[in-house]
């Protein structure tokens, strides 16, 4: 088969991807070091011509139809370091005639994913691989791992077994892998991890199984190295016992069935009966433990999509390094962090989509908190300085609650209102859909917000001076869907405002922007505007990029400024083809089709054109 095909060759690298090849080409340079034959139709791998390429270091045979490996096919490739046979048909009996892959003395990475391999077969396929560092067996049909599965792989560090059907891992299955640091067992059928004992492991992915319990081996002097543990999308009923994992930095427990206990534990030894719900909150560490404080190094904890109704004080106590805590989509009715120094490093707290009615944040707790997500709860009467106490808070989302903002210091407002003035760190605030009836004067005084969303508060009354103090900072303002008929906001004073959303109100007039400002996007959809006079809009011409106007009863005449934008202006007006206007006769036409003479007919001069 001395047949040249249009491969790409660079130095000693050759790519023959997706060329419909039925055989390994024999006319490639003999000193080729990298050969990519992926995406072809190879069915068998023979020692000849593959053996001609003795300099090969990288060989990619993925996504072919390989079902036959000639014994010794790779024997001559003494420099081979990376071999991919992913997505082939190695499970067919002919692949294993004698000795499977054979010895791979220098191969450091081997990809056998997507081959429908089953357990007994794998042991026959894998030969001696003393240098193997990375092995992928993902997307196969493995049901169990025995102590014979991974033999002769003393250097293996990374093992990927995701998307198999593993139900059983025999004791000692990984014993022959003393250097294993990364293990991916996600998307299998595991139900229990009862004796986790891989001390050298750093990263363990157990997501998307059916695990009901996770228990480390009770070895008092054990020095577990695990830093990253993913248990999301399992069936855990309790917070797992992680006291033996002092180095844990990342822990994902989302999408389980976890409930935290409501009362104190019955004893204080650290390991508790699952029936008590304490299977074990990380309360105390085994005596020989390096750190003595379980989870004290944890940076990221995700408990979203569980069934947690309450967070016990003791649970948060040891999380002294935690930066990111996600408790969204649980059943929390209350959340408290009152103690001095509680969660001192926490930067993001997501409590969204719970059933929170009360929130108690101590004056000096959560000192590093920058982002607080509370959307989709039932918060109503909060202590007035709930958020003002958070010294580092930058972003606060309260969408879908029932929070009523207080006024400024001179006009405090009714009981149960929450102060949003004087929060000097706060930059972004969402009060969407909070049934706010009145926004009082000075509500955001000395709070230099750049983004404020007050949308979906139908009937909202914005008092004069309600946005006072934001003139020099506000960049994004949304007041969509509030039924506003007049705007008690002197918009031209907001010199930094870039995006303004006034859609779905009943506005018919805008203040005059006579001098240049920063506004880039103006959304006026579904209001009552008939005219946008040039006298009011002129100051926007230098900055405005997008103007949304659909759903307004625009007049065909007198809208010269708008017509000019449609024809040659810099402003991109949405849906220009469909922007409908009305003549006094109620005749509707596309605004872009209106000519000056159409307005002169009835003595209606188009004053701006």
């Amino acid at each position: 088969h001395q047949d040249k095909v249009p491969c790409k060759m660079v130095d000693k690298k050759v790519s023959c991807q997706v060329l419909g090849l039925l055989q390994v080409p024999s006319v490639l340079p003999p000193d080729t070091e990298t050969l990519d034959l992926s995406g072809n139709q190879l069915r068998s791998i023979l020692a000849s011509p593959l053996g001609f390429y003795t300099a090969l270091r990288h060989l990619d045979l993925s996504t072919n139809e390989i079902s036959f490996l000639q014994p010794g096919a790779f024997q001559a490739l003494t420099h081979l370091e990376h071999l991919s046979l992913a997505h082939n048909r190695l499970a067919m009996a002919t692949a294993l005639s004698a000795g499977g892959l054979g010895p791979l003395p220098r191969v450091t990475s081997l990809d056998l994913s997507g081959n429908s391999l089953y357990s007994g077969l794998l042991e026959r396929l894998l030969g001696e691989a003393p240098s193997l560092h990375t092995l992928s067996l993902a997307e196969n049909s493995l049901t169990r791992l025995t102590r014979h599965t991974f033999r002769d792989m003393p250097a293996l560090e990374q093992l990927d077994l995701h998307s198999n059907v593993l139900m059983d891992i025999e004791d000692g299955a990984f014993e022959g892998l003393p250097r294993l640091t990364h293990l991916n067992l996600s998307r299998n059928s595991l139900t229990c991890i009862s004796d986790f004992s891989l001390q050298q492991l750093r990263v363990l992915d157990l997501s998307c199984n059916s695990i009901e319990a996770f228990q480390t081996a009770s070895q008092p002097q054990a020095e577990f190295q695990l830093t990253w543990l993913d248990l999301r999308e399992n069936k855990l009923l309790h917070f797992p016992d992680l006291a033996a994992l002092p180095r844990l930095i990342y822990l994902n427990l989302s999408n389980n069935l976890i409930r935290l206990p409501t009362g104190p534990p019955q004893d204080s030894k650290g390991i508790h009966a699952p029936s008590e719900g304490w299977s074990a909150l990380p309360l105390s560490a085994p005596s020989g433990n390096a750190s003595g404080r379980p989870l004290s190094q944890l940076l990221n904890l995700d408990l979203s999509y569980n069934e947690i109704e309450l967070i016990p004080d003791s649970f948060l106590e040891h999380l002294t390094s935690l930066c990111f805590l996600n408790l969204s989509r649980n059943c929390l009715r209350t959340f408290e962090a009152r103690r001095l120094g509680s969660l001192p490093c926490l930067m993001l707290l997501d409590l969204s989509h719970n059933a929170l009615e009360t929130l108690e944040l101590g004056a000096r707790a959560l000192g590093s908190l920058r982002t607080l997500l509370l959307q989709g709860n039932a918060l109503r009467d909060l202590p007035p300085y709930t958020f003002a106490n958070l010294a580092s808070l930058q972003r606060l989302n309260l969408q879908g609650n029932r929070v009523s903002p207080c006024g400024g210091p001179d006009e405090p407002g009714p009981s149960g209102c929450v102060a949003f003035s004087g929060i000097t760190s706060l930059r972004s605030l969402s009060l969407v859909d909070n049934e706010i009836e009145l926004l009082r004067a000075g509500a955001f005084l000395h709070t230099p917000l750049t983004e404020l969303d007050l949308s979906s508060n139908p009937g909202l009354e914005v008092a004069t001076g309600a946005l006072g103090g934001l003139e020099a900072s506000l960049e994004v303002l949304a007041l969509q869907g509030n039924g506003l008929m007049v705007l008690q906001v002197d918009l031209p004073c907001f010199i930094c405002l870039k995006r303004l959303n006034l859609a779905e109100n009943r506005l018919s007039h805008l203040p005059a922007w006579t001098q240049a400002v920063s506004l880039e996007v103006l959304d006026l959809r579904n209001n009552s505007f008939s005219l946008l006079p040039g006298s009011a809009m002129g100051g926007l011409e230098t900055s405005l990029r997008r103007l949304y106007l659909q759903g307004n009863p625009l007049s065909c005449c007198g809208n010269g400024w708008l017509a000019a934008q449609l024809h040659q202006g810099r402003v991109d007006v949405d849906a220009t083809q469909d922007l409908i206007c009305r003549f006094s006769s109620q005749e509707e036409v596309s605004l872009s089709h209106v000519r000056p003479e159409d307005c002169e007919k009835g003595g209606l001069k188009n004053i701006n054109l």
């Epitope: 047949d3 040249k4 095909v5 249009p6 060759m9």
Partner: antibody, heavy 120, light 111 residues
Framework: EVKLVESGGGSVKPGGSLKLSCAAS????????MSWVRQTPEKRLEWVAT????????YYPDSVKGRLTISRDNAKNTLYLQMSSLRSEDTAMYYC?????????????WGQGTSVTVSS | DIVLTQSPASLAVSLGQRATISCRAS??????????MHWYQQIPGQPPKVLIY???NLESGIPARFSGSGSRTDFTLTINPVEAGDVATYYC?????????FGGGTKLEIK
């Protein structure tokens, strides 16, 4: 001196057939990947087909697959393009071209072309 | 398919001046650190001829006045200085991904 000479062009009605030939000389024909490229009346270049040096493998863009067939006779140093079910958009100047020695789709020598017109 | 967009569609340059033609790919044409972008010249009445292969390599027999540069998606053919015999249409071609595609061409004229 490398020489490629196309022949077989002409006028044909839509749905008709035509067979183009390309006689090669001045190089070891059987060592090279060969291609056909066409140039539309608007002067756009379009790759039409490629064949491996031994003739075992052929490659086409989706727009001509099933209608155009490339083949070669290494004994006669000749490349062919059988064209059937022709359409008006197949009207073009058809060039025979030699691929680079390493087998890439880059074409280092081209013939003078043969014109094909498909019109009713 | 990878789309190649050449600009300008035509340009007029004075003799002895520099001509620059651009070719932009809809996605990267790099493999193994090399760019599989090539440039052809088609003098009126003649077939195309390779000038530059793999972005910057001069085909043998082509004068050094022609040079190519670029990587990933943005490529340039430069002719400096332009001579009368350079009046032609110039095409870029990518062979990184099947099917190989050509740009729409740039017509060079003398001012």
């Amino acid at each position: 001196e490398v020489k490629l000479v196309e022949s077989g062009g002409g006028s044909v009605k839509p749905g008709g057939s035509l067979k183009l030939s390309c006689a090669a000389s001045g190089f070891t024909f059987s060592n090279y990947v060969m291609s056909w490229v066409r140039q539309t009346p608007e002067k756009r270049l379009e790759w039409v087909a490629t064949i491996s040096s031994g003739g075992s493998y052929t490659y086409y863009p989706d727009s001509v697959k099933g209608r155009l067939t490339i083949s070669r006779d290494n004994a006669k140093n000749t490349l062919y393009l059988q064209m059937s079910s022709l359409r008006s958009e197949d009207t073009a100047m058809y060039y025979c071209a030699r691929g680079y020695d390493n087998g890439d789709y880059v074409m280092d020598y081209w013939g003078q072309g043969t014109s094909v017109t498909v019109s009713s | 398919d990878i789309v190649l967009t050449q600009s300008p569609a035509s340009l007029a340059v004075s003799l002895g001046q520099r001509a620059t033609i651009s070719c932009r790919a809809s996605e990267s044409v790099d493999t193994y650190g090399n760019s599989f972008m090539h440039w052809y010249q088609q003098i009126p009445g003649q077939p195309p001829k390779v000038l530059i292969y793999r972005a910057s390599n001069l085909e043998s027999g082509i004068p050094a006045r022609f040079s190519g540069s670029g990587s990933r998606t943005d490529f340039t053919l430069t002719i400096n200085p332009v001579e009368a015999g350079d009046v032609a249409t110039y095409y870029c071609q990518q062979t990184n991904e099947h099917p190989p595609t050509f740009g729409g061409g740039t017509k060079l004229e003398i001012k």
